[in-house]
């Protein structure tokens, strides 16, 4: 029987020729478990792996822990990789998180992190976010320092109230904080003034929810 | 902000050195860091700044010759060496992370110039 | 260098006025002004950046407004804890500078 390629990330798929942007089975690292994920083989050079998609509301974001943990939706549309393998891959070398976002009048904007991870389960999968550039705000969205994250059945944010289900989705909550990619998708002409909405605060302000966003890692020395 | 802390200030005499310091959190280690200091009951006055890996430096005209910035990242550390100090000097210093505008500060450090 | 002109340099106020700080640069500076809230024996405090973007923090009592060479800071109902001084900076052009300040104090 012909040995299986292992890759950790897209990167790896990429680097051993495998260039067309797709779903692709990824294997956690030091183990012999597998998640489905989306390669973007074409977005600045390729190589990245996608962990989170909003497009079309076709996915209901307001998930558990467990779900956020392991992932939901489907790689080539809609959703979210899981906290458990974007922890484990960003823990054995330095990543860059790119943020892709479409607001609803044909606009686009990215901000990228020149440093990327997430603690583990038992720091509530924390984000570490280091060296923001790009045009969707001078100032990280995603609060600094990062905070833990949170969902409708685990509160680990700053703030009084439950910011997960008020704002829906999980996210990395701060008091509640300038952004939630997972929040509540409204349509066209529906987008504004909406508190629970896609919020990207230093690109769009107060109240907008997008139309489209992506958030892709891929290692610092690819 | 305990995310900046300036350290290293003091009383010095006119003509005299003094190097000051500021712990960043790591996450200021792809930032540009400044310097920027008020003088007692006066207004804020941009001392300099640092690019990340310390490459690029910017220091405003008037402190040229006498006023130097560097970093040490893998101590999470800005400094300010001041040179050939005066009265005038007499200020409180902050550092200060640089977007052009500064959005975080530290809670600054006094130097008295004084004989 | 470029020179801020800031005015008024102090006002009196009660709470719930409205208040108006402006800011002249001496030169175009495309929006590329900040500007920050000071109170005693603390660092200044960030409000607004890039003319008119408020920071996530701050209430909405505070905008920013302007272009070109002229920049307002509006605080539309003042509250108690908004008796500080205020400043605006350029970051346009090298070196950095602020405006001089204006004390708002309660009348």
């Known amino acids: 029987k012909e040995e299986q390629i292992i890759f950790r990330d897209c990167a790896e798929a990429f680097k051993s020729g495998l260039t067309t942007s797709g779903t692709y089975t990824l294997t956690f690292p030091n183990s012999t478990e597998e998640t489905k994920a989306y390669c973007d083989m074409e977005t600045g050079g390729g190589g990245w792996t996608v962990i989170q998609r909003r497009e079309d509301g076709s996915v209901d974001f307001q998930r558990t822990w467990k779900e956020y943990k392991m992932g939901f939706g489907s790689p080539s549309g809609e959703h979210w990789l899981g906290n458990e393998f974007v922890s484990q891959v960003t823990n054995q070398k330095r990543y860059v998180l790119k943020i892709h976002l479409r607001d609803w009048e044909g606009n686009e904007a990215y901000s990228l992190y020149e440093h990327f991870y997430l603690s583990s389960e038992e720091f509530n999968y924390r984000i570490h976010l280091k060296g923001l550039t790009g045009t969707a705000g001078k100032i990280s969205s995603i609060s600094q320092p990062g905070n833990d994250f949170s969902t409708k059945d685990a509160d680990n944010d700053k703030c009084i109230c439950k910011c997960s289900q008020m704002l829906t989705g999980g996210w990395w909550f701060d008091a509640c904080g300038p952004s939630n990619l997972n929040g509540m998708y409204y349509p066209q002409r529906q987008n504004t003034n909406k508190f629970n909405g896609i919020k990207w605060y230093y690109w769009k302000g107060s109240g907008y929810s997008l139309k489209a966003t992506t958030m892709m890692i891929r290692p610092a020395d690819f | 902000s305990e995310h900046l802390v300036e350290s290293g200030g003091g009383l010095v005499k006119p003509g005299g050195s003094l190097r000051l310091s500021c712990a960043t959190a790591?996450?200021?280690?792809?930032?540009?860091m400044s310097w920027v200091r008020q003088a007692p009951g006066k207004g804020l006055e941009w001392v300099g700044s640092?690019?990340?890996?310390?490459?690029?430096?910017y220091l405003n005209t008037k402190f040229i010759g006498r006023f130097t910035i560097s970093r040490d990242d893998s101590k999470n550390t800005l400094y300010l060496q001041m040179n050939s100090l005066r009265a005038e000097d007499t200020a409180v210093y902050y550092c200060a992370r640089d977007v052009g505008f500064f959005d975080w500060w530290g809670q600054g450090t006094l130097v008295t110039v004084s004989s | 260098a470029i020179y801020m002109h800031q005015e008024p340099s102090s006002l009196s106020a009660s709470v719930g006025d409205r208040v108006t700080i402006t800011c002249h640069g001496s030169y175009w500076l495309n929006s590329e002004v900040a500007w920050y809230q000071q109170k005693p024996g603390k660092a200044p405090k960030l409000l607004i950046f890039?003319?008119?973007f408020k920071v996530y923090e701050v209430p909405s009592r505070f905008s920013g407004s302007g272009s070109h060479e002229d920049y307002t800071l509006t605080i539309s109902s003042l509250q108690p804890e908004d008796f500080a001084t205020y400043y605006c900076?350029?970051?346009?052009?090298?070196?950095?500078?602020f405006g001089h300040g204006t004390k708002v104090e309660i009348k």
């Open positions: 790591d996450f200021f280690e792809y930032d540009d």
């Open positions: 640092i690019s990340p890996k310390g490459d690029h430096k």
């Open positions: 900076q350029q970051y346009r052009y090298h070196p950095y500078t």
């Open positions: 890039d003319g008119d």
